[in-house]
């Protein structure tokens, strides 16, 4: 806590401007008028006060508004905003695009930071839902932002904001993510013509249901590989070779390369070796001719 | 890409002055403060002076106050230490410097200019 | 705020961890920052408070601390990292340089 002194003569500040560098941590604690600090934030930023500083004004402002600073305020922290515990935050009532891109802006280059993480949530909590401009938003400053947010939370993500997605905000999203996400793409996408939906579905596959790999492998798509690779491995266990040779198309002949690996491994032990010796491709591992494969899951439904 | 350079430094007598100059280029100079920081021989660094923006607010280290005037002329890019009443100890390698806002750091420098104050 | 710098000098081969340290005074929060000076050159920013790595810094340089006591570490040696460094605060006016670290080949 700064101690409360008198504001020696002719120091008492009438604007926020460069002078104040040169006020002592007493000084400005003395001479500053809250109030004016409140209209004149924007002036801040083009100020270099040091973090002793910074941390007396911050201070001024939790003084003046305990129960939270005023979105007029929070618009305008800019570098202060650095300053702010999540706690500090959680006090806040942000309900502008505006002010939380204003935010991320001083934020820009870094990882998400708790501060950060908290505003997000509490703008997120204020609207309802994940809209598709905030989603805009937050992709454009956090690329990963999509895949930290749990599958409960990406269930209030309408289909239309969907749009907004890019195929890198999903890199880091693991298979349940994909899994919610998968059908708003497939319903915010459904109006697309073959080639033109594939493009656009192809980075939330990790998501598809068999019958629509299925589908897809009817429309002359020739998915890459890496798209492949990261497949449900239930969805790609019941496809046929003649199906997985259709959706792949020609990068059939990357198949030789990740056969040790999922989810083609697996696929491999479930295909009868003669099946697989049609792609030419020395596939080993599959059913050996003469065997007889009993699908104990449809056994089990039927009883 | 951010470019500075000095001039000016060179030897000169205990008592006499000098004039150093730096030109910079490769952004908008008037949006920044500005630093003169310097490097005595084999020593440390040591922060001399900073100019704002605008230049209507000037720091100097107390080692200089009095001796040192720091100015800008924004129109020419160029930053200015005009160094008076130069002493011994003032032998240095001069830096200018770009300063951030947030935070307060130096984050482009010049080659610096050396400045020899000998009899 | 003065700063001290340990060791003044070390000795390191390729491949070596190193650790510098920069002690303040007083208590600088998080207000520090690390510069690299190689003979003849003007030195470079490295990090910034306490521990955000400068834009085009290689990630084996890395900081750490809060308060008073703040680590320099640069996780392993390569030729172009013989140098000086330097710490800085901006906590509080007049901004300082500790009396730097000079890495040297063993």
């Known amino acids: 806590e700064v101690e409360k002194t008198a504001c020696p003569s002719g120091k008492k500040a009438r604007e926020i401007d460069e002078s104040l560098i040169f006020y002592k941590k007493w000084e400005l604690e003395a001479c500053v008028d809250a109030a004016l600090l409140a209209t004149q934030m924007d002036r801040v930023n083009a100020i270099p006060f040091t973090y002793e500083q910074l941390d007396v004004l911050k201070h001024k402002l939790d003084e003046l508004y305990p129960q939270g600073y005023p979105e007029s305020v929070i618009q305008h922290l800019g570098y202060l905003f650095l300053k702010m515990s999540p706690e500090d935050i959680r006090k806040w009532n942000v309900t502008s695009l505006e002010t939380l891109k204003a935010l991320l802006e001083v934020n820009k280059g870094h990882e998400m930071s708790p501060q950060v993480a908290t505003l997000i949530d509490r703008f997120v909590k204020g609207r309802g839902q994940l809209d598709k401009d905030t989603l805009d938003t937050l992709t454009a400053f956090y690329p990963g932002y999509l895949c930290s947010l749990s599958p409960e939370e990406l269930s209030s993500v309408p289909p239309s904001s969907i749009w907004a997605v890019r195929p890198q905000d999903l890199d880091t999203c693991d298979p349940r993510q994909l899994d919610v996400l998968y059908p708003k793409a497939r319903l915010a996408f459904q109006n697309m013509n073959g080639s033109e939906y594939f493009v656009k579905i192809q980075s939330f596959l990790g998501g598809a249901p068999t019958e629509d790999l299925k589908a897809l492998s009817q429309q002359n798509v020739s998915m890459d590989l890496a798209t492949f690779m990261k497949l449900r491995t239930d969805a790609v266990l019941p496809l046929t070779v003649a199906e997985v040779q259709k959706l792949l198309g020609p990068h059939v002949e990357g198949l030789k390369a990740e056969e040790r690996h999922r989810p083609v491994r697996d696929w491999i032990l479930r295909q009868r070796q003669d099946d697989l010796d049609t792609l030419g491709l020395g596939l080993q591992g599959g059913i050996p001719n003469g065997y007889l494969v009993l699908d104990l899951s449809m056994q089990e439904a039927l009883s | 890409q951010v470019q500075l350079v000095e001039s000016g430094g060179g030897l000169v007598k205990p008592g006499g002055s000098l004039r150093l100059s730096c030109a910079a280029s490769?952004?908008?100079?008037?949006?920044?403060?500005m630093s003169w920081i310097r490097q005595a021989p084999g020593k440390g660094l040591e922060w001399v002076s900073y100019i704002s923006s605008s230049g209507s607010t000037i720091y100097y280290a107390d080692s200089v106050k009095g001796r040192f005037t720091i100015s800008r002329d924004n129109a020419k890019n160029s930053l200015y230490l005009q160094m008076n009443s130069l002493r011994a100890e003032d032998t240095a390698v001069y830096y200018c410097?770009?300063?951030?806002?947030?935070?307060?750091?130096?984050?482009?420098w010049g080659q610096g200019t050396l400045v020899t104050v000998s009899s | 705020i003065q700063l001290t710098q340990s060791p003044s000098s070390l000795s390191a081969s390729v491949g070596d961890r190193v650790t510098i340290t920069c002690r303040a005074s007083q208590g600088i929060s998080s207000a520090l920052a690390w510069y690299q000076q190689k003979p003849g050159k003007a030195p470079k920013l490295l990090i910034y408070d306490a521990s955000s790595l400068e834009s085009g810094v290689p990630s084996r340089f890395s900081g750490s601390g809060s308060g008073t006591d703040f680590t320099l570490t640069i996780s392993s040696l390569q030729p172009e990292d013989f140098a000086t460094y330097y710490c800085?605060?901006?906590?509080?006016?007049?901004?300082?340089f500790g009396g730097g670290t000079k890495v040297e080949i063993k």
């Open positions: 410097a770009r300063d951030l806002i947030f935070p307060v750091v130096f984050d482009y």
């Open positions: 800085q605060q901006f906590n509080s006016y007049p901004l300082t």
């Open positions: 490769g952004f908008t100079f008037s949006d920044y403060y």
